[in-house]
């Protein structure tokens, strides 16, 4: 389970307030850090182990997910054809 936490607010600029947000995730046994719907998430460790990245549903709703060659990451393809690539180190 993950929740979005507001860490601090930048009040040095009076005309706008900048909030810095981060995810705080508590994973269950058998889960580790991953990405689901383009957000931090706890995912089945077996997905990470086998590098079947698309099984964690990393792309936004309506986008297509494809594995990169050698399973080094994944691509998310938007309906308009724009591609976002994520590589895993």
């Amino acid at each position: 389970t993950c929740e979005i936490v507001t860490l601090d607010r930048d009040s040095s600029q009076p005309r706008r307030t900048i909030a810095r947000q981060t995810a705080r995730c508590a994973c269950r046994k058998g889960q580790i850090a991953g990405t689901t719907r383009a957000r931090p998430a706890c995912v089945d460790a077996r997905i990470i182990k086998t590098k079947q990245w698309c099984d964690m549903l990393p792309c936004l709703e309506g986008e297509g997910c494809d594995l990169l060659i050698n399973r080094s990451g994944w691509t998310c393809t938007q309906p308009g054809g724009r591609i976002k690539t994520t590589t895993v180190s």
Epitope: C25, A26, C27, K29, G30, A45, K49
Partner: antibody, heavy 129, light 103 residues
Framework: AVTLDESGGGLQTPGGALRLSCSAS????????MFWVRQAPGKGLEYVSE????????NYGSAVKGRATISRDNGQSTLYLQMNSLRAEDTGTYFC??????????????????????WGHGTEVIVSS | ALTQPSSVSANPGETAKITCSGG???YGWFQQKPGSALVTVIY???ERPSDIPSRFSGALSGSTNTLTITGVQAEDEADYYC???????????FGAGTTLTVL
């Protein structure tokens, strides 16, 4: 190099208490789930307890549940095991162990016994009157 | 409880296999020689620490993990424990240990 150094063992009396420590170095301690595992003389390994990387979650083996408390100080890179109401069956060598997976910032992760990749040399505990 | 054989024997140069079943998530293999510290030879099913010889390998098939030592050497004689999570997935568990004898 990853180093785990246990201390705090020794001769204890039945019904007494002890606190074991494990000093870690050579890695980012706060990112890893940690374990205590013990071994009675001439016997196999027994799961004692574990703690998540950030200390928010703990778990215990049935033999020590209710008598043991695992904790950690990430600032000091130290793992602890408090054992109360000691019994003769608690006699053995207590090992500190690290789970390999490095949990990223913002996440709280459990270790996995199958992912233990580093062990301490152990500290011997003898419970006897 | 995990199931692993109590003993396995092999001649030098032969291949020794030790199986472990009955757990969930991932499996590890831990070597213990008399009077020596525990050494992880395999973790997360098939990962080998950098200082462990390549003759050690692990493979997962279903819920059974097999430790294979290809080209057994005299110094491999030791007790080998498998470790994983119990079937409930809530606590760690270890096998009773397998004694590898090099004939």
């Amino acid at each position: 190099a990853v180093t785990l150094d246990e201390s705090g063992g020794g001769l204890q009396t039945p019904g007494g208490a002890l606190r074991l420590s494990c000093s870690a170095s050579g890695f980012d301690f706060s990112s890893h789930g940690m374990f205590w595992v013990r071994q009675a003389p001439g016997k196999g390994l027994e799961y004692v307890s574990e703690i998540t990387n950030d200390g928010s979650g703990t778990n215990y083996g049935s033999a020590v549940k209710g008598r043991a408390t695992i904790s950690r100080d990430n600032g000091q890179s130290t793992l602890y095991l408090q054992m109360n109401s000691l019994r003769a069956e608690d006699t053995g060598t207590y090992f500190c162990a690290r789970s390999n997976y490095a949990c990223p910032g913002g996440f709280s992760c459990w270790g996995d016994t199958g992912q233990i990749d580093a062990w301490g040399h152990g500290t011997e505990v003898i419970v006897s009157s | 409880a995990l199931t692993q054989p109590s003993s396995v024997s092999a001649n030098p140069g032969e291949t020794a296999k030790i199986t472990c079943s009955g757990g969930v998530y991932s499996y590890g293999w831990f070597q213990q020689k008399p009077g020596s510290a525990l050494v992880t030879v395999i973790y997360w099913d098939d990962e080998r620490p950098s200082d462990i010889p390549s003759r050690f390998s692990g493979a997962l098939s279903g819920s059974t993990n097999t430790l294979t030592i290809t080209g057994v050497q005299a110094e491999d004689e030791a007790d080998y424990y498998c470790g994983t999570e119990d079937i409930s997935g809530t606590a760690g568990v270890f096998g009773a240990g397998t004694t590898l004898t090099v004939l």
